[in-house]
């Protein structure tokens, strides 16, 4: 499996789209900051086999997709940018799915590192809960947007390391 240069370009485009999605200045939202306890250890990539790392990356993309495709999200962001964002994420998920299948074979994929997947799911649960508590305010969405950018940049770094292993 080769996480190609095209995939890397997709990553950069995803981050750029997220940066463009900003609707409110974060300088105005400092008081709304929150520590979502990003599971960084799951993205260090040292303890993983390649297939495990890819499945964690895929979960990250899937959860990001889910978060930004809700009704509340559609109301918060520019529709055109959101559409482009979905396309980039979808492309990345397809690439990663192909990689998982290639690495371990179809049969083994469902039983991949469940603890890591669970850690990512819980991280997104904390984000969803925060948004609900803040009643999906513009500042809450800005905090989440910045947090997802940060976590996607960790994903990008992990993918770079995986490419170097190839």
């Amino acid at each position: 499996c080769n996480l190609s240069q095209t995939h890397s370009l997709n990553n950069r485009r995803t981050l750029m789209l997220m940066a463009q999605m900003r609707r409110i200045s974060p300088f105005s939202c400092l008081k709304d900051r929150h520590d979502f306890e990003f599971p960084q250890e799951e993205f260090d990539g040292n303890q993983f086999q390649k297939a495990q790392a890819i499945s964690v990356l895929h979960e990250m993309m899937q959860q990001t997709f889910n978060l930004f495709s809700t009704k509340n999200s559609s109301a918060a962001w520019d529709e055109t940018l959101l559409e482009k964002f979905y396309i980039e994420l979808f492309q990345q998920m397809n690439d990663l799915e192909a990689c998982v299948i290639q690495e371990v074979g179809v049969e083994e994929t469902p039983l991949m590192n469940e603890d890591s997947i669970l850690a990512v799911k819980k991280y997104f649960q904390r984000i969803t809960l925060y948004l609900m508590e803040k009643k999906y305010s513009p500042c809450a969405w800005e905090v989440v947007r910045a947090e997802i950018m940060r976590s996607l940049s960790f994903s990008t770094n992990l993918q770079k390391r995986l490419r170097r292993k190839d």
Epitope: S25, F27, L30, V143, A146
Partner: antibody
Framework: QVQLVQSGAEVKKPGSSVKVSCKAS????????ISWVRQAPGQGLEWMGG????????NYAQKFQGRVTITADESTSTAYMELSSLRSEDTAVYYC??????????????WGQGTLVTVSS | DIQMTQSPSSLSASVGDRVTITCRAS??????LNWYQQKPGKAPKLLIY???SLQSGVPSRFSGSGSGTDFTLTISSLQPEDFATYYC?????????FGQGTKVEIK
């Protein structure tokens, strides 16, 4: 690596304006915040305001509202700070400072070398 | 605006001394406090962020503590290169504000 290079020293007359530039290299210019901080001779540090190039709209400290304009040119990776209606109390070293990419603009991670602006008749 | 008050405004110490600088905020700022070091003619340099996190590349003799309104910067064993002015800065809300500075001089 990250570098912020500011324009040279300026001597200005009271009532005039000054525009200081800050050219950034390293990282994606449009997606991180740049702030301007000033320091009068022998005094402490004072945040004037900040901008995120991709967002475009700047935030200003109330004290400088109406007198300061912070802008950014993505094509040249340069941020600008213009201060108008200059008075002698505006004599200071003006720093641009960069905040971390993908982070909230709360700490100043990288600094320019500073630009001395002297206001004198 | 949140006022930041540092004490002392200056202190004299010798190499090897343990030095403590305090910073008080006019209202609770949680842990949103940063510390900077500035040498004459130079730009400030970030030492500590979020009250106690050491910035990458900063020697471990520097440490920060506190939350709410009271914060401390400690230099466990003062080195010749540590003689400088130190500033605290709150990042709880805009405008971002700094303390007036503490000058650490050679005794």
């Amino acid at each position: 690596q990250v570098q912020l290079v500011q324009s040279g020293a300026e001597v200005k007359k009271p009532g005039s304006s000054v525009k200081v530039s800050c050219k950034a290299s390293g990282g994606t210019f449009s997606s991180y915040a740049i702030s301007w901080v000033r320091q009068a001779p022998g005094q402490g540090l004072e945040w004037m305001g900040g901008i995120i190039p991709i967002f475009g709209t700047a935030n200003y400290a109330q004290k400088f509202q109406g007198r300061v304009t912070i802008t950014a040119d993505e094509s040249t990776s340069t941020a600008y700070m213009e201060l108008s209606s200059l008075r002698s109390e505006d004599t200071a070293v003006y720093y641009c400072a960069r905040h971390l990419e993908y982070a909230f603009p709360d700490k100043f991670d990288y600094w320019g070398q500073g630009t001395l602006v002297t206001v004198s008749s | 605006d949140i006022q930041m008050t540092q004490s002392p405004s200056s202190l004299s110490a010798s190499v090897g001394d343990r030095v403590t600088i305090t910073c008080r905020a006019s209202q609770s700022i949680s842990s949103y406090l940063n510390w900077y070091q500035q040498k004459p003619g130079k730009a400030p340099k970030l030492l500590i962020y979020f009250a106690s996190s050491l910035q990458s590349g900063v020697p471990s003799r520097f440490s920060g503590s506190g939350s709410g309104t009271d914060f401390t910067l400690t230099i466990s064993s003062l080195q010749p290169e540590d003689f400088a002015t130190y500033y605290c800065q709150q990042s709880y809300s805009t405008p971002l504000t700094f303390g007036q500075g503490t000058k650490v001089e050679i005794k």
